[in-house]
């Protein structure tokens, strides 16, 4: 549950977008789940995946849209402050996290061309940084009508309010558990060796543990791979090199919140793995 207690907006703007691509886009995340997307071509904040079905108040997405249009204007305005041709990529990470005592901790940091260079100082109510480009952008943003106040409101009030609303209304989505479907396969490697690959498909939440046993004893975790699927679920795999002919001594153990207990995965027979 801990990982769900954050609401983060990942904002990106580019000074020279390719034709037909947006100059500004946003993904909104509740813990590890993307719930929102926005881009400057559509100009509308929209729910993602299962969040389409969340029972939200009628004006909720209009408010998200209004806030992100303000952010779009600010981000694209930043490039004017920098001058020159660029190209520039400006990113923002804005949001909040609920602590154990239910208090909200805001986050507001910015990167230019992948380097963190600016933040929003909540005490001062201003953007700040040391580099020339940070000061140029912050100065430009300060000149925008009530921009700093809007940022404060967004971070201190809108964000925690939205997060608590989602925890309330979208509890089903946040508590979604999808157990992994599993496979353990062997393939020849260098002479005299095979590679065992234990694969987990379509699981949620993303926390998952894979490990190998040899004749019931720990044989390590192997070399792993992990990534998201387009539907919001995740996939993972782990590979271990073993001696040829020894494969059948191994099994894979998977632990996941969607499983009542650790699952033992046996090696597939060669006929089945075709």
């Amino acid at each position: 549950a801990e990982s769900h207690l954050s609401l983060l907006y990942h904002l990106t703007a580019v000074s020279s977008p390719a034709p037909g691509t947006p100059a500004f886009w946003v993904s909104g995340w509740l813990g590890p789940q993307q719930y929102l997307s926005y881009n400057s071509l559509r100009g509308e904040a929209e729910p993602c995946g299962a969040w389409v079905w969340e029972n939200q108040v009628s004006w909720y997405w209009e408010k998200e849209t209004t806030d992100l249009r303000i952010k779009e204007k600010l981000f694209l305005e930043a490039f004017k402050a920098l001058g020159g041709k660029g190209p520039y990529t400006l990113q923002g990470l804005l949001g909040c996290e609920l602590g154990p005592d239910n208090t909200s901790v805001p986050t507001a940091k910015f990167a230019l061309n992948g380097e963190e260079f600016m933040n929003f100082d909540l005490k001062q109510g201003t953007w700040g940084g040391d580099w020339p480009e940070a000061l140029a952008i912050s100065q430009r943003w300060q000149q925008q009508d009530k921009a700093a106040n809007k940022e404060l409101t967004f971070l201190l009030f809108s964000c925690p309010h939205r997060l608590r609303e989602h925890l309330e209304r979208g509890r089903g989505n946040l508590e979604w558990k999808e157990p992994p479907s599993m496979r353990l396969k062997a393939r020849p490697s260098s002479p005299g060796f095979s590679v065992l690959t234990c694969s987990a498909f379509s699981f949620y939440p993303p926390e998952l543990q894979l490990r190998f046993l040899r004749n019931g004893l720990a044989a390590g975790t192997g070399q792993g791979d992990f990534g998201p699927n387009s539907d919001g679920s995740f996939h993972a795999s782990s590979s271990l090199t073993v001696k040829s002919g020894d494969e059948h001594h191994y099994c894979c153990i998977v632990q996941h919140a969607g499983l009542a207990q650790p699952l033992r995965v046996e090696l597939e027979s060669p006929a089945k793995s075709s």
Partner: antibody, heavy 121, light 106 residues
């Protein structure tokens, strides 16, 4: 092409203020980029001091912050360094430089020839 | 502040020799710039962002590195390369320069 030229006194007495001017030709200091003062001590060590961005925003090396200021005169396309309460440790060659942006990076592309300032009584 | 240490402080090389100058940062930096300063003149940009040659710089110069360790290589030393070379970082405020490596002809 853009050129920078430093000017100011060759000799300053300890505890006095040092004032230097950088005159820019071939590019407007309000058009873009940032404009810096960097000094080089007799042992050749380089120290970045301060900048003024084309937007007018300024910043300083924390080690000098209490006694340094940078200003500009946009009508003359000049920017200025003032260093207060100088000591013999401030004896150096003072350079003005432009920091530009290109290919996703910022770097000092043009430097003035430098002006040598000696602090001595 | 990030401290930049250049080594060696002074280096003598024969014409045609390959030379490598190093710059070590006290904390990891994203990229490094290199400047060349000939006697009695101001520093001149040589390499920006670790490995990109500045305009007009001969191809015998190259740069590489990452994290805390960066280097500048001259594939074949020429007489006009006798100068002091400085590295400079811009990853962590304030801007800092290395102490320089003076390259002389043997």
């Amino acid at each position: 092409q853009v050129q920078l030229k430093e000017s100011g006194p060759d000799l300053v007495k300890p505890s006095q203020s040092l004032s230097l001017t950088c005159t820019v030709t071939g590019y407007s200091i309000t058009s873009g980029y940032s404009w810096h003062w960097i000094r080089q001590f007799p042992g050749n060590k380089l120290e970045w001091m301060t900048y003024i961005h084309s937007s007018g925003s300024t910043n300083y090396n924390p080690s000098l912050k209490s006694r340094i200021s940078i200003t500009r005169d946009t009508s003359k396309n000049q920017f200025f360094l003032q260093l207060k309460s100088v000591t013999t440790e401030d004896t150096a060659t003072y350079y003005c430089a432009r920091e530009v942006y290109g290919n996703y990076y910022w770097y000092f592309d043009v430097w003035g020839a430098g002006t040598t300032v000696t602090v001595s009584s | 502040d990030i401290v930049m240490t250049q080594s060696p402080a002074i280096m003598s090389a024969s014409l045609g020799e390959e030379i490598t100058l190093t710059c070590s940062a006290s904390s990891s930096v994203s990229y490094m710039h290199w400047y060349q300063q000939k006697s009695g003149t101001s520093p001149k940009l040589l390499i920006y962002s670790t490995s990109n040659l500045a305009s007009g710089v001969p191809a015998r110069f190259s740069g590489s590195g990452s994290g805390t360790s960066y280097s500048l290589t001259i594939s074949r030393m020429e007489a006009e390369d006798a100068a002091t070379y400085y590295c400079q970082q811009r990853s962590s405020y304030p801007y800092t320069f290395g102490g320089g490596t003076k390259l002389e002809i043997k």
